[in-house]
């Protein structure tokens, strides 16, 4: 905590400049006027302050703007952004993509995922939706940051924007996020031909339902194992051995490598061993011949 003292007359601050790097923490606290600091924030990042000193400046801004900083200040935070907590950022209203770019550049490569996620969230809220310009900014300055957004925020993406999303932007997306993005992607790419469609839809397939996966198996797409492993477990389990064979094409041999991993393991347990044997891969764990399968979940649903 910063002690309160009065400012010595010779230390009075009339502008934010490099002389302030020689001020002790309590001198900064006593002598820097918060309103002056806010008005001249554009100078701060060019001055070689220590983070210890930046903490004092942050404290002054927090006192001046207890409800959250205005965008005129946020835009010029520079390395002071590294001192912000998600709780600080949650108070902001950010609409400018220039502000977003500036702060993404500062936070690049640092352990700031929570702060960056909160910042992006504030931008989406401030702009009203996740529009093409915002997506373009995220993909350019923060690959993977799209997946830091909640499914609720992602639901504001118009399908027309989906084309701007690159495969690597979805690498860290979870199933709930892909559940939201997949139908949008399907709509966005619906007029494309088979092979072109598959290339475009592939990164989103972690959100695809069984019927869509079944449809793909009829189109000779030769899905790679990495994509197959990212499919929803519920989408894979109802597939027959023949459908999986058609879906994967020459990549079907990869099932042996993934035999112990979900969703392959769970899918194997659902298949008749006879059917699995037709693949000639030595997959084990299917339902033995002569066993009757009762799906009790259906009976419970009817009663």
């Amino acid at each position: 905590d910063v002690e309160r003292t009065t400012c010595p007359p010779e230390k009075e601050v009339h502008e934010i400049d490099e002389s302030l790097i020689f001020y002790k923490k309590r001198e900064l606290e006593a002598c820097v006027d918060a309103a002056l600091l806010a008005a001249q924030m554009d100078r701060v990042d060019a001055i070689p302050f220590t983070y210890e000193q930046l903490d004092v400046l942050k404290h002054k801004l927090d006192e001046l703007y207890p409800q959250g900083y205005p965008e005129s200040v946020i835009r010029h935070l520079g390395h002071l952004f590294l001192k912000m907590s998600p709780e600080d950022i949650r108070k902001w209203n950010v609409t400018s993509l220039e502000t977003l770019k500036a702060l993404l550049k500062v936070s690049k490569g640092h352990e700031m995922s929570a702060q960056v996620a909160t910042l992006i969230d504030r931008v989406v809220v401030g702009r009203g939706q996740l529009d093409k310009d915002t997506v373009d900014t995220l993909t350019a300055f923060c690959p993977g940051c799209l997946c830091s957004l909640s499914p609720e925020r992602l639901s504001s993406v118009p399908p027309s924007v989906i084309g701007a999303v690159r495969p690597q932007d979805l690498d860290t997306c979870g199933p709930r996020q892909l559940d939201v993005l997949y139908p949008k992607a399907r709509l966005a790419f619906q007029n494309m031909s088979g092979s072109e469609y598959f290339v475009k839809i592939r990164p989103f397939l972690g959100g695809a339902p069984t019927e869509d996966v079944k449809a793909l198996s009829q189109q000779n797409v030769s899905m790679d194992l990495a994509t197959f492993m990212k499919l929803r477990r519920e989408a894979v389990l109802p597939l027959t051995v023949a459908e999986v064979q058609k879906l994967l094409g020459p990549h079907v041999e990869g099932l042996k490598v993934e035999e112990q991993h979900s969703p392959v393991r769970d899918w194997i347990l659902k298949q008749r061993q006879d059917d699995l044997d037709t693949l000639g891969l030595g997959l084990q764990g299917g339902i033995p011949n002569g066993y009757l399968i009762l799906d009790l979940s259906v009976r419970e649903a009817l009663s």
Partner: nanobody, 116 residues
Framework: QVQLVESGGGVVQPGGSLRLSCATS????????MGWFRQAPGEQRELVAR???????MYADSVKGRFTISRDNSKNTVLLQMNSLKPEDTAVYYC??????????WGQGTQVTVSS
């Protein structure tokens, strides 16, 4: 994490000189160059001199014309030549820098005492 080790402190009479050295254990990626700071008993740490990444030097008014900061890149060291020392220069002297991630780093300090 890069270690900073200061040396060269000691007891000196007013008007005397000392040369402080700060050795770094590796390459430093600093946002604001390297600085020499000092802390007198009961006082907060203050910056005395700084050398920026581009070689620009900056000095506190109280030491201008008496202290000189320099860098020897081949030896990964930052030097502080202190001339015309005064009793009010008595303090523990630290070298330090700020990374690009939000952290300040300091050495363990070296004591400088100016006394007759």
């Amino acid at each position: 994490q890069v270690q900073l080790v200061e040396s060269g402190g000691g007891v000196v009479q007013p008007g005397g000189s000392l040369r402080l050295s700060c050795a770094t254990s590796g390459t430093i990626f600093s946002r604001n160059g390297m600085g020499w700071f000092r802390q007198a008993p009961g006082e907060q740490r203050e910056l005395v001199a700084r050398i920026l990444n581009d070689g620009t030097t900056m000095y506190a008014d109280s030491v201008k014309g008496r202290f000189t900061i320099s860098r020897d890149n081949s030896k990964n060291t930052v030097l502080l030549q202190m001339n015309s020392l005064k009793p009010e220069d008595t303090a523990v002297y630290y070298c330090g820098y700020s990374d690009y991630r939000g952290t300040d780093y300091w050495g363990q300090g070296t004591q400088v005492t100016v006394s007759s």
